[in-house]
């Protein structure tokens, strides 16, 4: 049995997959900050997790996905206020009893040191220094991401 949060996540991901392919993103749009091969947008207002997920979707983006601890640290370096929390694209899947990214993959237990409980209706937020489990209904800020298309240099055969 999927929770309402899981259904919302699946529905939005499916609708994103149905949309027509768009040309690759070479530069970050206005207001988005480049972090390596991603563009990040930090919200100013607050929302529960599912509304944050939906807002990113309307901007043709997703809630932030963090590949590893190194990417977490670099993202946290952009958060200069210790008191601010941001939703990312990770929530607890009751059916699989595990933390699940909105792209369908599961959290590698070594990637993030989560403070708080892993239980139903729990979603993950990050601050400047830590990673927290919060009730998904909590209203905090959020981070959207867009992937930049890597620019591949053309290789010409020797003449």
């Amino acid at each position: 049995q999927k929770s309402s949060i899981e259904k919302c996540s699946v529905d939005i991901q499916q609708s994103r997959n149905k949309t027509t392919e768009r040309p690759g993103l070479l530069n970050c749009p206005i207001y988005w900050q480049q972090l390596r091969e991603k563009c990040l947008l930090f919200s100013h207002t607050v929302n529960p997790w599912n509304n944050s997920l939906a807002d990113c979707s309307t901007k043709e983006s997703s809630l932030l996905l963090i590949r590893d601890k190194d990417e977490l640290i670099h993202t946290q370096n952009l958060i200069r206020d210790k008191a601010i929390l941001f939703w990312i694209g990770l929530n607890f899947s009751l059916s699989e009893k595990n933390w699940k990214w909105i792209n369908g993959s599961f959290l590698n237990s070594n990637d993030l040191e989560i403070r708080g409980d892993a239980k139903e209706n729990s979603c993950i937020s990050i601050s400047q220094t830590s990673v927290y489990s919060e009730y998904c209904s909590t209203e905090i800020r959020w981070i959207c991401q867009k992937e930049l298309t890597p620019v591949r240099n053309k290789v010409y055969p020797d003449s």
């Epitope: 749009p29 206005i30 207001y31 900050q33 947008l41 930090f42 919200s43 100013h44 207002t45 901007k59 952009l78 958060i79 200069r80 206020d81 601010i84 800020r141």
Partner: antibody
């Protein structure tokens, strides 16, 4: 209620640097984009650039080589420096709050006229 | 950069009449990120409409925005005496954000 107040000299000599500060009250600067816009007398509006509280900036390409915007979160202020000014830089300079792709320039300072003249 | 062209340059109308202001973009405005501002002499601009059709906080419902792509319209359903001012459109979907040259709504 968020309020913005520009301050700085009203007269700058040609080739010198124009320096303005915007003080934000009624809200924290640790969010939003903080923008500068100018309006030459009797003319339209021109966006100069913005800064995010973490130091991320974006400038109008037409002014980029001469513009620096900085932020001081401890004082709830952000500043504009425009170097090598000419008479064409004479304008009313406004600071404003910008919520980016959510809501654009929703709070403005009252503006300050800067005249470039020797 | 995106060039915004507003028309007409001046609109002469009487209180109670309907005002229709046009803003045309040189290329499509991303996600309808288009705003309208009102400016009175000696004052800073005031945000009226954002996202092409959403009214900003505290803006009366006689102001409405519409359009997408390259063509946008600001409509004032019944002009009040305080509505006579200059109106600017702005796109904020592409860098740099740009403004139209303005439409002056004056009393006939």
């Amino acid at each position: 209620q968020v309020q913005l107040q520009e301050s700085g000299p009203g007269l700058v000599k040609p080739s010198e640097t124009l320096s303005l500060t915007c003080t934000v009250s009624g809200g924290s600067i640790s969010s939003y984009f903080w923008s500068w816009i100018r309006q030459p007398p009797g003319k339209g509006l021109e966006w100069i650039g913005y800064i995010y509280y973490n130091g991320h900036t974006n400038y109008n390409p037409s002014l980029k080589s001469r513009v620096t915007i900085s932020v001081d979160t401890s004082k709830n202020q952000f500043s504009l420096k425009l170097s090598s000014v000419t008479a064409a830089d004479t304008a009313v300079y406004y600071c404003a709050r910008d919520s980016g792709p959510w809501v654009p320039l929703d709070y403005w300072g009252q503006g300050t006229l800067v005249t470039v003249s020797s | 950069e995106i060039v915004l062209t507003q028309s007409p340059g001046t609109l002469s109308l009487s209180p109670g009449e309907r005002a229709t202001l046009s803003c045309r973009a040189s290329q499509s405005v991303i996600s309808s990120y288009l705003a309208w501002y009102q400016q009175k002499p000696g004052q800073a601009p005031r945000l009226l409409i954002y996202g092409a059709s959403s009214r900003a906080t505290g803006i009366p419902d006689r102001f409405s925005g519409s359009g997408s792509g390259t063509d946008f319209t600001l409509t004032i359903s019944r002009l009040e005496p305080e509505d006579f001012a200059v109106y600017f459109c702005q796109q904020y979907g592409s860098s740099p954000p740009t403004f139209g040259q303005g439409t002056k709504v004056e009393i006939k």
